[in-house]
C-alpha cells in the first residue's frame, strides 16, 4: 500500500481467483483514544472499533472510503484504491490502446517545435467518475523539471455503438534550449482513475522524436503564362522554432484529387515555393517536416487549383 | 559564445555540402545497424545515450545561432580552448566566435573518427564478420575535416591489447551511431545558419 | 494487373511521320498518366512528353516540342505518340509508360523500334 | 534542363559482393530522384522512387539513399539476375531527365 495524495491509498493486489488479497491497517489521524468506529462509504454498519482498523482487501467491495468516527462526528477518512496486477502486468483498463507506433501505446505525444513545449493525449470510452493527474520530468535518476497543466477533456468521437473521449495535457520543460542535444528522455507519468480502480501509464521519448511541425502557412497560387504549371509558394508556420536558417524544414507539395487512389503530381523541396501540374477538380496540398532530423510530417495545408 | 550573423558570401561555404553527406552517411550507417543488430539493444528506447565529446568540445554552445543567445537555458557556463585557423568559409570575415564553433565541430569529428576507426579494427576480428564500419561514412568525416582545414594534435588510435568483447563492441557501436547522428544534425543545422547568415 | 501493348515496329524515310499506338488494359485508362520515352541503340533513356488522358493535357521535353504529338482516346483506351520529320537519329524504342504519380514512372510498355533510314 | 550524371558507366561485381551506384545532378533536387533497373532487349523496371523509398515486389537488397545533389543506388549482394543497366532519373523539375545508365557487370 502507498499513499497516492493525502488520505487517498492504494492497494496493489494480485489479481486471480481466490487470491489471498492484502491485509491493510487504517489509523485514524485522531489524538482521540478510545470510543472510535469505523464505517465504509455510505453505509452506516460499523466495521470495527478502536484507533486502527485492520482489513482484508481482496475485491473492489473492499476498496473505497473508510471513515473513522466518534460519537457521530467525522474524524477523518481515508480512500482506498485498488491497482490490479494480473500474471504479472498492471491491468489497463482506464485508457485505450492507440497501437500507433506500436501496440500498447496509451499516451501519445507530440510537439509543435523545440522549446520544450509538448502536448500528450489519451483515448477512453469512459465518461464519468474519471480523474487523471499528470507528472513529468527530464531523466529519472537526477529528474530535472517539467511542468504540466491539468488534463481535460479534449475531444469526444462516436466510434461504432460507442463513444470515445480524448483528454489532453500541456506541458513545459523548465529550462529548455532549442538547440541542445538531448541525452535523457522526458517522462511523463499519467496516474487515472475511475470509480476505485487506480492506473498508472508512463511514456519516455525525446522532444526531437516527437516533432511534428504545424502545417506551412500562406499557401498561395501563381499560374504560370502559357503552360499547365502553377507556382505554389507558402511560409513556415508561425509555431516553428527560430532562426528558420538553423531549424529548416523541407516540404512536400501535391496536387491530388479528392480520391487518395487518383493519379497525382508530387514534388519534395527544400525551398518555400515549387512549380507543379494542377489539374480541374484537384487541391494542391503542402506538408512540412525537420529537415535534417525526419520525424512526422506535418499535416497538410491545402488550396484548390482552380 | 555564438555565431555573428555577418558571414559568408553566398556560395563560398563548402561545408555545408559536406555536413549534408555527413548527416546522410550517419544515417545510412545507423539504419545499417539497427537492420544487421535487430537481436541487439540498438534501437534509441534501448540504448543509453552517451556523448564522447561531453566536456572536451561544446559545440552546441560555441554554435548558437545569435538569435538564441537571449535564451539563459542555452548557454552553458562551460569553457573549452579551441584552434582558431579555420579556413572553411574560404573568407576573410570568419570571425573569432566562428572560428571557435568550426574548431569545436572539427575537435567532434576527430574524437569521432579515431573512435570509429579503433571499433572497425575490433569488428574486422569478429570471427562473424557481421558488422563493418561504412568506408563511405569514414571517408566523408574525413571530407569535412579536410574541409574546415583546422591544425590539431593528432590523436592517436586507440589499440587495445585484450581480446575484443564483440557483443560490447556491438552495442558500443550502436551507442557512438546514435550519438554522432545527433552531433550530425547539430552540425548541419550550424552550416545551414552559417550559410543562410 | 495494368498492361501496356504498343504497336509494332516501324521503318521511315527521313522527313517523315511515325504514329505509335500504346493500348491500356486493367484499370481505368484516365486514372493515370501516359509517358512517352525513347532509347536509341545502345543509349540511355530520354524522356519525350506525358499526357493527361482525363483532359488531354500534355507537357512535352522542349527538346521534341513542335515535333511530337502525344495523344489519347478514351474509348479505346489508348495512347498515340506521333514524331515528325524524322530524321536518322530517332533511331530508337520508343516505350510508352503508365503512371499514378506524375514524375516517375511505374508500368512500362514493351517497346516499339521505329528505324529511320533512306 | 537538370543533367544528371552518374557513376561508374561499367560496374564489374563479383556474384555475392555489394555493388553502389552514384548519382549526381546539376541542380539540388531534393530526394526528387528515382531508380530503374533494364535488361538487355527488355523495358525499364522501377526500383526505387524519392531517392530512398523500397518499391513493391522489389528485392531488399536494392536500397538507395541521397538527397541534394548526391545520391547512391546500393545493392547488398548482387543475384545472378542483377546484372544489368541502372537508371537514375530526376523528377524536381520538366523536362524529366535520366542518368546515362551504369552497366553492372559480371566479374
Known amino acids: 500500500i502507498w499513499e497516492l495524495k493525502k488520505d487517498v491509498y492504494v492497494v496493489e493486489l494480485d489479481w486471480y481467483p481466490d487470491a489471498p488479497g492484502e491485509m491493510v491497517v487504517l489509523t485514524c489521524d485522531t489524538p482521540e483514544e478510545d470510543g472510535i468506529t469505523w464505517t465504509l462509504d455510505q453505509s452506516s454498519e460499523v466495521l470495527g472499533s478502536g484507533k486502527t482498523l485492520t482489513i482484508q482487501v481482496k475485491e473492489f467491495g473492499d476498496a473505497g472510503q473508510y471513515t473513522c468516527h466518534k460519537g457521530g462526528e467525522v474524524l477523518s477518512h481515508s480512500l482506498l484504491l485498488l491497482h490490479k496486477k494480473e500474471d504479472g502486468i498492471w491491468s489497463t483498463d482506464i485508457l485505450k490502446d492507440q497501437k500507433e507506433p506500436k501496440n500498447k501505446t496509451f499516451l501519445r505525444c507530440e510537439a509543435k517545435n523545440y522549446s520544450g513545449r509538448f502536448t500528450c493525449w489519451w483515448l477512453t470510452t469512459i465518461s464519468t467518475d474519471l480523474t487523471f493527474s499528470v507528472k513529468s520530468s527530464r531523466g529519472s535518476s537526477d529528474p530535472q523539471g517539467v511542468t504540466c497543466g491539468a488534463a481535460t477533456l479534449s475531444a469526444e468521437r462516436v466510434r461504432g455503438d460507442n463513444k470515445e473521449y480524448e483528454y489532453s495535457v500541456e506541458c513545459q520543460e523548465d529550462s529548455a534550449c532549442p538547440a541542445a542535444e538531448e541525452s535523457l528522455p522526458i517522462e511523463v507519468m499519467v496516474d487515472a482513475v475511475h470509480k476505485l480502480k487506480y492506473e498508472n501509464y508512463t511514456s519516455s521519448f525525446f522532444i526531437r522524436d516527437i516533432i511534428k511541425p504545424d502545417p506551412p502557412k500562406n499557401l498561395q497560387l501563381k499560374p504560370l503564362k502559357n503552360s499547365r504549371q502553377v507556382e505554389v509558394s507558402w511560409e513556415y508556420p508561425d509555431t516553428w522554432s527560430t532562426p528558420h536558417s538553423y531549424f529548416s524544414l523541407t516540404f512536400c507539395v501535391q496536387v491530388q484529387g479528392k480520391s487518395k487512389r487518383e493519379k497525382k503530381d508530387r514534388v519534395f523541396t527544400d525551398k518555400t515555393s515549387a512549380t507543379v501540374i494542377c489539374r480541374k477538380n484537384a487541391s494542391i496540398s503542402v506538408r512540412a517536416q525537420d529537415r535534417y532530423y525526419s520525424s512526422s510530417w506535418s499535416e497538410w495545408a491545402s488550396v484548390p487549383c482552380s | 559564445r555564438n555565431l555573428p550573423v555577418a558571414t559568408p558570401d553566398p556560395g563560398m561555404f563548402p561545408c555545408l555540402h559536406h555536413s549534408q553527406n555527413l548527416l546522410r552517411a550517419v544515417s545510412n550507417m545507423l539504419q545499417k545497424a539497427r537492420q544487421t543488430l535487430e537481436f541487439y539493444p540498438c534501437t534509441s528506447e534501448e540504448i543509453d545515450h552517451e556523448d564522447i565529446t561531453k566536456d572536451k568540445t561544446s559545440t552546441v554552445e560555441a554554435c548558437l545561432p545569435l538569435e538564441l543567445t537571449k535564451n539563459e537555458s542555452c548557454l552553458n557556463s562551460r569553457e573549452t580552448s579551441f584552434i582558431t585557423n579555420g579556413s572553411c568559409l574560404a573568407s576573410r570575415k570568419t570571425s573569432f566566435m566562428m572560428a571557435l564553433c568550426l574548431s569545436s565541430i572539427y575537435e567532434d569529428l576527430k574524437m569521432y573518427q579515431v573512435e570509429f576507426k579503433t571499433m572497425n579494427a575490433k569488428l574486422l576480428m569478429d570471427p562473424k564478420r557481421q558488422i563493418f564500419l561504412d568506408q563511405n561514412m569514414l571517408a566523408v568525416i574525413d571530407e569535412l575535416m579536410q574541409a574546415l582545414n583546422f591544425n590539431s594534435e593528432t590523436v592517436p588510435q586507440k589499440s587495445s591489447l585484450e581480446e575484443p568483447d564483440f557483443y560490447k563492441t556491438k552495442i558500443k557501436l550502436c551507442i557512438l551511431l546514435h550519438a554522432f547522428r545527433i552531433r550530425a544534425v547539430t552540425i548541419d543545422r550550424v552550416m545551414s545558419y552559417l550559410n543562410a547568415s | 494487373q495494368v498492361q501496356l501493348v504498343q504497336s509494332g515496329a516501324e521503318v521511315k524515310k527521313p522527313g517523315s511521320s511515325v504514329k505509335v499506338s500504346c493500348k491500356a488494359s486493367?484499370?481505368?485508362?484516365?486514372?493515370?498518366?501516359l509517358h512517352w520515352s525513347r532509347q536509341a541503340p545502345g543509349q540511355g533513356l530520354e524522356w519525350m512528353g506525358w499526357?493527361?488522358?482525363?483532359?488531354?493535357?500534355?507537357e512535352y521535353a522542349p527538346k521534341f516540342q513542335g515535333r511530337v504529338t502525344i495523344t489519347a482516346d478514351e474509348s479505346t483506351s489508348t495512347a498515340y505518340m506521333e514524331l515528325s520529320s524524322l530524321r536518322s537519329e530517332d533511331t530508337a524504342v520508343y516505350y510508352c509508360?503508365?503512371?499514378?504519380?506524375?514524375?516517375?514512372?511505374?508500368?512500362w510498355g514493351q517497346g516499339t523500334l521505329v528505324t529511320v533510314s533512306s | 534542363d537538370i543533367v544528371m550524371t552518374q557513376s561508374p558507366l561499367s560496374l564489374p561485381v563479383t556474384p555475392g559482393e555489394p555493388a553502389s551506384i552514384s548519382c549526381r545532378s546539376s541542380d539540388s533536387i531534393s530526394i526528387n530522384l528515382h531508380w530503374y533497373q533494364q535488361k538487355p532487349g527488355q523495358a525499364p523496371r522501377q526500383l526505387i522512387a524519392f531517392a530512398s523509398q523500397s518499391i513493391s515486389g522489389v528485392p531488399s537488397r536494392f536500397s538507395g539513399s541521397g538527397s541534394g545533389t548526391d545520391f547512391t543506388l546500393t545493392i547488398s549482394s548482387l543475384q545472378p539476375e542483377d546484372f544489368a543497366t541502372y537508371y537514375c532519373?530526376?523528377?524536381?523539375?520538366?523536362?524529366?531527365?535520366f542518368g546515362q545508365g551504369t552497366k553492372v557487370e559480371i566479374k
Open positions: 532519373q530526376q523528377s524536381n523539375s520538366f523536362p524529366l531527365t
Open positions: 499526357i493527361d488522358p482525363e483532359n488531354q493535357d500534355t
Open positions: 509508360a503508365r503512371t499514378k504519380e506524375l514524375r516517375y514512372i511505374d508500368v
Open positions: 486493367g484499370g481505368t485508362f484516365s486514372d493515370y498518366y
